[in-house]
């Protein structure tokens, strides 16, 4: 049972009868096989649902797919097969939606073998109408739009061709051959790399980086010996093969890559990789994995440019096996991040950060949980999150963390409390400041989902069984009411909520089964009538964020700010609705030393703030100083850490030195230290 | 120790307004809500209204909506409610307190410290 | 705005007894409840928030308990200095106090 099922909760009065008249049933007359589900635009309530059967014949496999659309948020759909003449459509390629409110979709089909190219299926009316328009490639990748203009499509097709529309995919032109990666920079540039031998396996590390910035009539080659790259934030990536052996670094450009620098990370071997964990237009969050088979490696945070970088996180568990890292950006805080580390003894831990990897600890004990047979003393352990690392070892685990940007500080995720990550059955918990504190809040592994910007939290048992109840809560996870969605139980697959958590529609879908047959079938609970009036200024409360000790002057002030939200209070039964924006109040904070990052050439000593000279330059930092760009090697010791608003306060002014002087090594004589390129 | 101390007795006619000050000392006062809370010869206590002083987001009882209002200073540390059009039901002791707080929420706690009050008659 | 209904109004009784008060809300407010204790001519003192946490410096024969809606403040052991009125509030909506209880000398 959930914590407050059994509590004096205050129940939504006649909820039963209000969900029952709004729970639509939709059964789907086509054999069970997958289902894939889109959203097409943003509160347009259009969902596309595209089913797909496959039959083992002897020789060849018979395909089946029929599509679906809803205009109502799932509550009716519409066979709409005949749209795309009846056309199997491969689901590898899911249903490219494009983006904003375009009401561009692209489905790509199945061929048969010998045909010159593939065909895909083009709507710009939400999925109105269909256009079927036959390719001159069989394409390898689904279509990817310019985020900034959604009539300009590219493709990768299986000859390693780079195909461009401007026409929405009317008609395509291949711009350049041998492509291996390709991706939309932004205003409308296409950045991709190339081979000019082999084939990509065989030129990984010989790959040159090109960009055109008029979808193909001009190309400017930016990067030579590319291992692979990426792009995060205003950030240009590029792991860039040494000269000297089969290490690689980092280079980053912050101007599409007309100039590059090194970056002051590790150098990889060919075993070892580097990962862009997140990024913004501030900094970037960088994962450097460590040499042999460990499934850790570390965590960097860079500074504005890209190119300076603090040790955020040692042990920081990625896996290379399966690429799996639990690392999660908690979108309903600013500044807060949650990851596993692997400690010494090879169980997994919980850390978080609240200020952008400054500082990482572990998280608090929820109030109402016990240490678990994980934990030495049986009163002092932590909360540990199963994350993906969890999903991929098929533990118990049918949900990643989930937190929405407009349900402020809000946190749901699956957990144990002990020492370490527990393989037993995990319970969920709830933080509602952004993972300071946390709560039970259900028994037991559930999916769950956030309806109209936290108003609601809808929550369903993971069970092997079949299901008919689902569980909701109007006071973010402290009291739950049980509904019966449906007289006979399904077979559950997935709850499906408009993305963006403003919805007060949620989908519950799952398959019938029966002596013969098993079918698709999905419910649709609209909530509206529990929540039945709007919020008013008085349903709501101010928080303050981030909140450690009101007896400090600088309480709350994370990245030289505090912000204070109206939050909606917990007993407040009302609608946020669908124009629901987050109200928040910033005020600037003064600058501390932690307001700054030690500049390349210092660092911080244990239990200090000051930035202390480094005596030499050692590894990485000696290879930065040796190839960097000049003007990144004067400096006064103090970089503002990206993002951070203070003002007044401590200013770290101090004398700039010229750190070219130090850089210096054994293994260099003079005249090649001189010769160095910039 | 935190001390909440209240500007004096107050004698007022009807129609007028009172302002009544609260000067914090020994804490933290921008990190705390002040509420107004009022208590009336031989009645209970009623909430007015309160105030964070970052941000001076201020927010009032229904029943006050309109003839109250709510300020703080940072810069001195007082807070203040002014209460217009007074009848001779608003004739009380007036009380400012701090909201205590453990979390983010800065309501959600109690009221930990008081001032002493101010006694406003209102009569013609 | 939520109400808070207190009960009794006023209790009479006598050193050493166990006195119970209660509050009910008119919605669930959580365990967002605070218990104040008033003596004539004084400012309220809070003995209790968040429903049953015990605020420093005060005896721990007072105890508060209940969520939701239904709230007691119990006094284990009446003692000399006890009597006085005790107010419960309520925090999640816009403040609300109850009426009052006068714990009185039997």
């Known amino acids: 049972s959930a914590p407050g099922e059994d509590e004096e909760c205050g129940a939504v009065r006649d909820f039963v009868a209000k969900l029952a008249n709004n729970t639509h049933q939709h059964v789907f007359d086509d054999l069970r096989g997958s289902v894939s589900l889109s959203w097409v635009g943003d509160s347009t309530g259009v969902i596309l649902v595209l089913t797909t059967f496959h039959v083992p014949l002897v020789i060849m496999t018979f395909g089946q797919s029929k599509l679906y659309r809803s205009e109502d948020y799932g509550k009716n759909f519409k066979d709409i097969t005949d749209l795309i003449n009846n056309t199997f459509i491969r689901t590898e390629f899911g249903m490219a939606i494009g983006p904003e409110n375009s009401g561009k979709v692209v489905l790509t089909a199945e061929v048969s073998g010998g045909s010159r190219g593939g065909r895909i299926f083009r709507s710009s009316d939400f999925a109105k109408n269909f256009v079927q328009t036959d390719l001159p490639f069989h394409p390898l990748t689904q279509m990817m739009y310019s985020p900034q203009n959604s009539d300009y499509l590219l493709a990768l097709s299986t000859e390693n061709g780079l195909w461009v529309s401007k026409n929405f995919g009317g008609k395509w032109e291949e711009i350049h051959k041998a492509v291996c990666l390709a991706k939309w920079g932004s205003d409308n540039t296409i950045f991709f790399t190339t081979y000019a031998n082999g084939s990509c396996k065989a030129d990984l590390g010989a790959l040159e980086l090109w960009r055109t910035s008029d979808l193909g009539k001009s190309f400017k080659t930016i990067g030579v010996k590319i291992y692979s790259f990426g792009l995060g934030g205003r950030f240009l990536f590029a792991s860039v093969m040494a000269d000297k052996d089969t290490t690689r670094r980092i280079h980053v450009s912050t101007d599409q890559g007309d100039t590059w620098s090194m970056a002051q990370l590790p150098s990889v071997g060919q075993e070892q990789f580097y990962s862009i964990l997140a990024a913004n237009d501030d900094m970037v969050f960088m994962h450097v994995d460590e040499p042999g088979d460990t499934g850790f490696g570390t965590i960097f945070t860079s500074d504005d440019r890209g190119i300076v970088y603090s040790k955020s996180l040692d042990r920081h568990l990625y896996t290379t096996t399966g690429g799996e890292t639990d690392f999660t950006n908690v979108t309903s805080l600013r500044g807060v991040y949650i990851t596993s580390v692997l400690s010494e003894d090879n169980s997994i831990q919980t850390m978080i950060t609240f200020d952008q990897g400054g500082r990482w600890t572990h998280l608090r004990k929820p109030e109402n949980s016990e240490c678990d047979a994980t934990a030495k003393n049986k009163n002092e352990c932590s909360l540990h999150i199963h994350a993906s690392y969890s999903i991929s070892q098929k533990l118990n685990v049918p949900m990643a963390p989930l937190s929405e940007p407009n349900a402020v500080g809000i946190v749901i995720a699956h957990g144990s409390v002990g020492d370490a990550i527990s393989v037993m059955v995990p319970d969920v918990y709830i933080s509602d400041d952004g993972g300071y504190s946390w709560t039970k809040m259900l028994e037991g592994p559930h999916y769950y989902t956030i309806l109209d910007s936290g108003g609601i939290i809808v929550a369903i048992e993971h069970s092997s069984r079949p299901i008919n109840v689902i569980k909701f809560s109007t006071d973010e996870g402290q009291c739950w009411q049980t509904y019966t969605f449906t007289r006979d139980p399904i077979y559950f697959t997935g709850l499906a909520s408009e993305p963006g958590a403003r919805s007060m529609n949620i989908s519950i879908w799952g398959f019938t089964e029966s002596f013969l047959t098993s079918q698709w079938v999905s419910y649709t609970i609209d909530f509206k009538d529990i929540l039945e009036r709007n919020c008013e200024e008085k349903d709501y409360t101010i928080w303050l964020a981030h909140s450690t000790d009101p007896e400090d002057y600088e309480d709350g002030c994370i990245l030289g700010y505090k912000e204070q939200f109206l939050r909606l209070r917990k007993s407040s039964v009302c609608q946020n609705g669908r124009d629901y924006v987050v109200t928040k109040q910033p005020s600037i904070c003064l600058c501390s030393l932690e307001d700054f990052l030690c500049d390349f050439g210092y660092y911080r000593p244990e239990n200090d703030s000051k930035c202390v000279e480094q005596p030499e330059l050692k590894g990485h930092d000696l290879e930065f100083c040796l190839y960097g760009r000049e003007e990144h090697l004067t400096t006064n010791g103090y970089r503002k850490i990206p993002g951070d608003k203070c003002q007044g306060g401590v200013n770290p002014v101090r004398e700039v030195k010229d750190l070219k002087k130090k850089c210096t090594s054994n293994f260099l004589s003079p005249e090649k230290q001189n010769s160095k390129s910039n | 120790q935190v001390q909440l101390v209240q500007s004096g007795a107050e004698v007022k006619k009807p129609g007028s307004s009172v302002k009544v000050s609260c000067k914090a000392s020994g804490g933290t006062f921008r990190n705390y809500a002040i509420s107004w809370v009022r208590q009336a010869p031989g009645q209970g206590l009623e909430w007015m209204g309160g105030i964070i002083p970052i941000g001076g987001w201020a927010n009032y009882a229904q029943k006050f909506q309109g003839r109250v209002t709510i300020t703080a200073d940072e810069s001195t540390s007082t807070a203040y409610m002014e209460l217009s059009s007074l009848r001779s039901e608003d004739t009380a002791v007036y009380y400012c307190?701090?909201?205590?707080?453990?979390?983010?929420?800065?309501?959600?706690?109690?009221?930990?410290?008081w001032g002493q009050g101010t006694t406003v008659t209102v009569s013609s | 705005d939520i109400q808070m209904t207190q009960s009794p109004s006023t209790l009479s009784a006598s050193v050493g007894d166990r006195v119970t008060i209660t509050c009910r809300a008119s919605q669930s407010i959580s365990s967002w409840l605070a218990w104040y204790q008033q003596k004539p001519g004084k400012a309220p003192k809070l003995l209790i928030y968040?429903?049953?946490s015990l605020e420093s410096g005060v005896p721990s024969r007072f105890s508060g308990s209940g969520s939701g809606t239904e709230f007691t403040l119990t006094i284990s052991s009446l003692q000399p200095d006890d009597f006085a009125t005790y107010y419960c509030q309520q925090a999640d909506g816009h403040i609300t106090f109850g009426g009052g209880t006068k714990v009185e000398i039997k």
């Open positions: 307190a701090r909201q205590g707080r453990k979390t983010g929420y800065y309501y959600y706690y109690g009221m930990d410290v």
């Open positions: 968040k429903a049953s």
